[in-house]
């Protein structure tokens, strides 16, 4: 079953290469287990950047070599992606799955365009 997912259209990463955005889903029921995946669509590729499964009210547990962190509050997930550089600029899509209890719901956001600008190197001081 389909579910609406909202996320900001544009986010500018900080000078330290950190980008944060909120992914909000319209839960049709009382889900207890939720899976959130961040997809990057750019360079003619689609990449699962990070994924987390969490029980409602608990911390997000990210899988594998995650460059993401996050917290949840109700139907909102606050996502942070770290270590970004200019080449990582692209469309980052939030995918939310309500895993338990049935029925299964899937929602995919329209994506957040994250712009990353590499900081200028500091000039050498004599």
């Amino acid at each position: 079953k389909a579910m609406h997912v909202a996320q900001p259209a544009v986010v500018l990463a900080s000078s330290r290469g950190i980008a944060s955005f909120v992914c909000e889903y319209a839960s049709p029921g009382k889900a207890t287990e939720v899976r959130v995946t961040v997809l990057r669509q750019a360079d003619s590729q689609v990449t699962e950047v990070c994924a987390a499964t969490y029980m409602m009210g608990n911390e997000l547990t990210f899988l594998d070599d995650s460059i993401c962190t996050g917290t949840s509050s109700g139907n909102q997930v606050n996502l942070t992606i770290q270590g970004l550089r200019a080449m990582d600029t692209g469309l980052y899509i939030c995918k939310v799955e309500l895993m338990y209890p049935p029925p299964y719901y899937l929602g995919i956001g329209n994506g957040t365009q994250i712009y990353v600008i590499d900081p200028e190197p500091c000039p050498d001081s004599d």
């Epitope: 990057r40 360079d43 590729q45 990449t47 699962e48 950047v49 990070c50 994924a51 899988l63 594998d64 070599d65 995650s66 460059i67 992606i81 270590g83 970004l84 080449m87 990582d88 692209g90």
Partner: nanobody, 125 residues
Framework: EVQLVESGGGLVQTGGSLRLSCAAS????????MGWFRQAPGKDREFVAA????????SYADSVNGRFTISRDNAKKMAYLQMNSLKPEDTASYYC??????????????????WGQGTQVTVSS
């Protein structure tokens, strides 16, 4: 480095399926991000798919997304590429590669320092 050997290539008709396998030996397989690349005659080598060290995260080229599935079995030191709905433009030599680095936003650009010898896939119309 790890040593990689691909298998499973062959001749298949348009719309058919193939499953490529990549057997690894040497270093700890689970320390490597794995990727599949392909090269058609007269063309540059191109990224096909990649999978993170535990197998939980994947990346696909737009041209194969929805048709190909990458997977791995760390216990068996194997990586796989399931190719469905094959098209003549999928004809190429397919190479398995290993990168001793973590996942990121652009796995196609990781430093893959181990490569197999390739297996030929030919899709006839």
């Amino acid at each position: 480095e790890v040593q990689l050997v691909e298998s499973g290539g062959g001749l298949v008709q348009t719309g058919g399926s193939l499953r490529l396998s990549c057997a690894a030996s040497g270093r700890t397989f689970s320390n490597y991000t794995m990727g599949w690349f392909r090269q058609a005659p007269g063309k540059d080598r191109e990224f096909v798919a990649a999978i993170s060290r535990s197998g939980s995260l994947k990346s696909y080229a737009d041209s194969v997304n929805g048709r190909f599935t990458i997977s791995r079995d760390n216990a068996k030191k194997m990586a796989y590429l399931q190719m469905n709905s094959l098209k003549p433009e999928d004809t190429a030599s397919y190479y398995c590669a290993a990168a001793p680095v973590p996942w990121g936003t652009r796995p196609s650009f990781l430093t893959y320092d181990s490569w197999g010898q390739g297996t030929q896939v030919t899709v006839s119309s």
